[in-house]
Interface confidence: low
């Protein structure tokens, strides 16, 4: 059974490669444990990019993922993806599956857009 | 549509093992979670694991963890239960489940000496 997922379209990194986004879903139901995975798309192909569990005592996510992290409050969830570069610019997807209790619902947002921009590098200055 | 055809059921002595398979067709479940779930004679269903779409993490039920280990093959698009250490409670039909498709017929699991 399907889920609405709801994430920004656009969001631009900062300078220092670091990309905030929500993404929201309609809770059909209580629910104890709630999975995460971000995916980005190229082409026609997903890649995992961090995936994480959040329950109502584990409500920081991605641990094992240095470069993501995530805060879970009721039905949101506060991605951020750090270390971005500029060949990093692409489409990525929230993916939010309602794991436990049942019934099983899973949902996938429409993306969020992430353009990333290199800083220009600093010219050296004889001071 | 995906449709989802439960197998491997039967009679098995307590302590026993029993490999349940859930072969899906009309799409490939590589990209969705795919839970087994079982429903007791007192009409009960009852969660039982959950397989996330990176097969490396699994999630169980504590009546079932450390005896039960669920898996899948996704280039036969096919979901596995493999049950070990078997009890009389968990006598139940077995069903496997994505959030693509409906509630399957299921495979009836007998624990009893």
């Known amino acids: 059974e399907a889920i609405q997922v709801t994430q920004p379209s656009v969001v631009l990194a900062s300078s220092h490669g670091v990309a905030s986004f929500p993404c929201e879903y309609s809770p059909s139901h209580n629910t104890d444990e709630v999975r995460v995975t971000v995916l980005r798309q190229t082409n026609d192909q997903m890649t995992e990019v961090c995936a994480t569990t959040f329950t109502e005592k584990n409500t920081v996510g991605f641990l094992d993922y240095p470069f993501c992290s995530g805060t879970f409050n009721e039905s949101r969830v506060n991605l951020t993806i750090q270390g971005l570069r500029a060949v990093d610019t692409g489409l990525y997807l929230c993916k939010v599956e309602l794991m436990y209790p049942p019934p099983y619902f899973v949902g996938m947002g429409n993306g969020t857009q992430i353009y990333v921009i290199d800083p220009e590098p600093c010219p050296d200055s004889d001071f | 549509q995906v449709q989802l055809v439960e197998s491997g059921g039967g009679l098995a002595q307590p302590g026993g093992s029993l490999r349940l398979s859930c072969a899906a067709s009309?799409?490939?479940?590589?990209?969705?979670?795919v839970g087994w779930y079982r429903q007791t004679p007192g009409n009960q269903r009852e969660w039982v694991a959950t397989s996330s779409t990176s097969s490396t993490t699994a999630t169980y039920a504590d009546s079932v963890k450390g005896r039960f280990t669920i898996s899948r093959d996704n280039a036969k698009n096919t979901i596995y239960l493999q049950m070990n250490s078997l009890k009389p409670e968990d006598t139940a039909v077995y069903y496997c489940?994505?959030?693509?498709?409906?509630w399957g017929r299921g495979t009836q699991v007998t624990v009893s000496s």
């Open positions: 009309g799409s490939t479940i590589s990209s969705v979670a």
């Open positions: 489940k994505t959030g693509l498709t409906n």
